[in-house]
């Protein structure tokens, strides 16, 4: 028996369902009574789900996993993982034993999009050219950690005087706060881009400082 899984990581959004694909080629005359199928967490060897002795033994992992019972006889040993969490991220091993055995591992990459950044200014009034201001760009509830880029109105990257912090909440999602300290010109636009490296999703925020009231 040869077990096959996806070489590419399976990317799943937090709170959605994911399918970890695993397949084998059954011989003619194969019956489920012969099948021993085990899914485990690769790194800790913890049992996730199993099908042995002709029946589905159920989920051993937070009751959020399921097989595709009607497709097993065709060699589909895929695992459904429901309501994906950050803590589900990692490698899963699919072990299949009939007359002989084989196994393969597939990686699950969890992701969550970042919110549109909110921009704040300090100080936020009586601003004059030459003043030092602090612009904060905040984006929430994303995963994995974000990449943050700042640019001026001409699209020139601003790399000096940038401090970015990322804090995980109780669900493992990150809130990102990036602070740019800049000396004001006569007027200008400052934009922040928060990128999710897995989803290749960009969230933009900008602030324009003129002699008039500020625009965000």
């Amino acid at each position: 028996v040869e077990v096959q899984v996806s070489e590419d990581p399976v990317v799943a959004l937090v709170d959605t369902d994911a399918t970890l694909r695993c397949s084998f080629s059954p011989e003619p005359g194969f019956s489920l009574a012969q099948l021993n199928l085990i899914w485990q967490l690769t790194d800790t060897k913890q049992l996730v789900h199993s099908f042995t002795e002709g029946r589905d033994q159920g989920s051993a992992y937070s009751n959020r996993t399921a097989l595709f019972p009607d497709l097993l006889v065709q060699g589909n040993a895929s695992l459904r993982l429901q309501r994906v969490r950050v803590t589900d991220e990692g490698s899963y091993t699919c072990f299949v034993s009939i007359q002989d055995f084989d196994s393969a591992a597939v990686s699950l990459q969890v992701a969550a999009p970042y919110s549109k950044p909110s921009m704040t200014l300090e100080p936020n009034k009586d601003l004059r050219p030459g003043n030092m201001v602090t612009i904060t760009c905040s984006s929430y509830q994303g995963y994995p950690e974000a990449e943050v880029f700042w640019k001026d109105g001409q699209g020139v990257p601003l790399t000096g005087n940038v401090t970015t912090s990322q804090m995980a909440n109780e669900r493992g999602l990150f809130d990102v706060h990036s602070v740019l300290r800049v000396v004001l010109g006569a007027n200008g636009t400052y934009s922040c881009l928060v990128r999710n490296p897995v989803l290749q999703q960009d969230a933009h925020g900008s602030v324009t400082i003129t002699g008039q009231p500020l625009t965000f």
Epitope: T42, D43, F95, F101, S103, A104, V106, S107
Partner: antibody, heavy 117, light 109 residues
Framework: EVQLLESGGGLVQPGGSLRLSCAAS????????MSWVRQAPGKGLEWVAY????????YYADSVKGRFTISRDNSKNTLYLQMNSLRAEDTAVYYC??????????WGQGTTVTVSS | QSVLTQPPSASGTPGQRVTISCSAT????????VSWYQQLPGTAPKLLIF??QRPSGVPDRFSGSKSGTSASLAISGLQSEDEADYYC???????????FGGGTKLTVL
Amino acid sequence: EVQLLESGGGLVQPGGSLRLSCAASGFTFRSYAMSWVRQAPGKGLEWVAYIGSSGGTTYYADSVKGRFTISRDNSKNTLYLQMNSLRAEDTAVYYCVKESYYYMDVWGQGTTVTVSS
Amino acid sequence: QSVLTQPPSASGTPGQRVTISCSATISNIDINRVSWYQQLPGTAPKLLIFNSQRPSGVPDRFSGSKSGTSASLAISGLQSEDEADYYCATWDDSLNSWVFGGGTKLTVL
């Protein structure tokens, strides 16, 4: 073809350090746990260290705990074993091993480490 | 002292059947997870049997079995190229470590 190629072995004095590397090819390295297993001259196999697929989980044999460090670079498909405070009893052939489920399905050809003054 | 005990040596003549045992000396070893490795002279070990089953490519002259706290490797129709060291191994969940038997040197007379 699945292959593991160890390098970095050699002669080192007691108390010295050495870093072994293992280049993996032919499989999705980032998805698999890996181990180092050694074999002293004329002796049996002895497991040394284990690392999970992402590198976050590591386990060590008592005989090397605190002296050896297993690590991996999934972007380079490479496994490492940093060996410090080496002793004569660390003299062995060191094998890089791919794990799957509860067995070791692929072994490298081994690299020889000799600790002697 | 290994928690998996193997006889240090075994022998047989060509065509014979030889059995090598692997006994667990502590109760928390799962005999259903025992794997067997063959190490031909001067080469790296190779997976031979897992949980009494062969991976594809291993001749059916090699077979595994288990009983109680012991696992066994049987080689039927012994051939000169079977002369090698044979090791049993298992993962110990309680210690998070691999455990190897001491190895059995098989001589084909």
